[in-house]
Amino acid sequence: LEVQVPEDPVVALVGTDATLCCSFSPEPGFSLAQLNLIWQLTDTKQLVHSFAEGQDQGSAYANRTALFPDLLAQGNASLRLQRVRVADEGSFTCFVSIRDFGSAAVSLQVAAPYSKPSMTLEPNKDLRPGDTVTITCSSYRGYPEAEVFWQDGQGVPLTGNVTTSQMANEQGLFDVHSVLRVVLGANGTYSCLVRNPVLQQDAHGSVTITGQPMTFP
């Protein structure tokens, strides 16, 4: 029995619902009474959802899963996963048994966009050209881990004297803090770009330092 799933991972935003597609080709005269369908976590073999003896056996996965009962007879064995969490990320296997047996695994890639970066300066007053300043770029509650890029006002990458750290919260979402140490010129714009590699989403923050001497409120 050929079971088909998408080759590419299913990307789902944290808190949204995701559909893990799985299909099979029922033979003429097929009835749901013949169908045994099992969804389980590929790595741990933990049961997620099942259908047997013509009945939806329900969710074994935090009551957040559902089948599409009206579509099963047409060979649609897809699974709906509600309120996606970081912990859901991974591979799910769809097992279909009628008279024959087949299975296939589909990957769920969880993602969450990073917030617009907040920028802070230290020190933040009485600044003059030649002073060394620390600029911190902070962005919150994204997933998976971010990449952070700094550049000056002309778009030239700033790679030296950058320290980036990432911390996961209890939900598995990441806060990223990146610190740039730079010697000030007469004028300067410093931009921080926080990139989510899965969503290909960039969040930008920048600070412009002008004047001579420079002061901040």
Epitope: Q109, S165, M167, P197, V198
Partner: antibody, heavy 122, light 108 residues
Framework: EVQLLESGGGLVQPGGSLRLSCAAS????????MSWVRQAPGKGLEWVSG?????????YYADSVKGRFTVSRDNSKNTLYLQMNSLRAEDTAVYYC??????????????WGQGTTVTVSS | EIVLTQSPGTLSLSPGERATLTCRAS??????LAWYQQKPGQAPRLLIY???TRAAGIPARFRGSGSGTDFTLTISSLQSEDFAVYYC??????????FGGGTKVEIK
């Protein structure tokens, strides 16, 4: 087959330099965070450095090597590098490269190279 | 930096016995913890990630548990190939990724 193969180790004098390479095969190298982990003789594992997925992406270092070691990657060549300068006796170790178990993430390493030995001695 | 402390340093047991290894974190790491096995002259091998999920191909006799600051790796019935050094590693806050000092499981 997913594989990592380190090279470039050897004997070097204190203050000298070495460049380690790690050739990857069997997976989409550009999708994975990579790390260097070392093990001094008779000691435990110490994470040395890591790099994010982009060419020229974010590099991370242990305090013990910051300013002396530089990690880089060439996604077109499926190769990870570790440039080691100002080497000290305490850098003597077997150096392993490791691949994260999931794309786009820095977590735990499920693929490791066989290791290359670096000896710093006069 | 999160410090991981493993105990005991050495565990002397016979084949067939149960091994219990512990790893304590200096601050909460949630379930962002992995366990590795390393045999002499070999690279480490990932056993457990997410504190309790077995990596591909790891036998069911290896079981990880715990969350927060206290973690346990249990080997239900030691086989001859299980005598090795075991390391825990956290990946909640980084850099740096940090490893525990290791527990050696040796034949009694």
């Amino acid at each position: 087959e997913v594989q990592l193969l380190e090279s470039g180790g050897g004997l070097v004098q204190p203050g000298g330099s070495l460049r380690l390479s790690c050739a990857a095969s069997g997976f989409t190298f550009s999708d994975y965070y990579m790390s260097w982990v070392r093990q001094a003789p008779g000691k435990g594992l110490e994470w040395v450095s890591g790099i994010s997925i982009s060419y020229g992406g974010n590099a991370y270092y242990a305090d013990s090597v910051k300013g002396r070691f530089t990690v880089s990657r060439d996604n077109s060549k499926n190769t990870l590098y570790l440039q080691m300068n100002s080497l000290r006796a305490e850098d003597t170790a077997v150096y392993y490269c490791g691949r994260d178990r999931s794309p786009y993430q820095y977590r735990s390493m499920d693929v490791w190279g066989q290791g290359t030995t670096v000896t710093v001695s006069s | 930096e999160i410090v991981l402390t493993q105990s005991p340093g050495t565990l002397s047991l016979s084949p067939g016995e149960r091994a219990t290894l512990t790893c304590r974190a200096s601050q909460s790491v949630g379930d962002f913890l992995a366990w590795y096995q390393q045999k002499p002259g070999q690279a480490p091998r990932l056993l457990i990630y997410g504190a309790s999920t077995r990596a591909a191909g790891i036998p069911a006799r290896f079981r990880g548990s715990g969350s927060g600051t206290d973690f346990t790796l249990t080997i239900s019935s030691l086989q001859s190939e299980d005598f090795a050094v075991y390391y825990c590693q956290q990946y909640k806050n980084w850099p740096p990724l940090t490893f525990g000092g290791g527990t050696k499981v040796e034949i009694k």
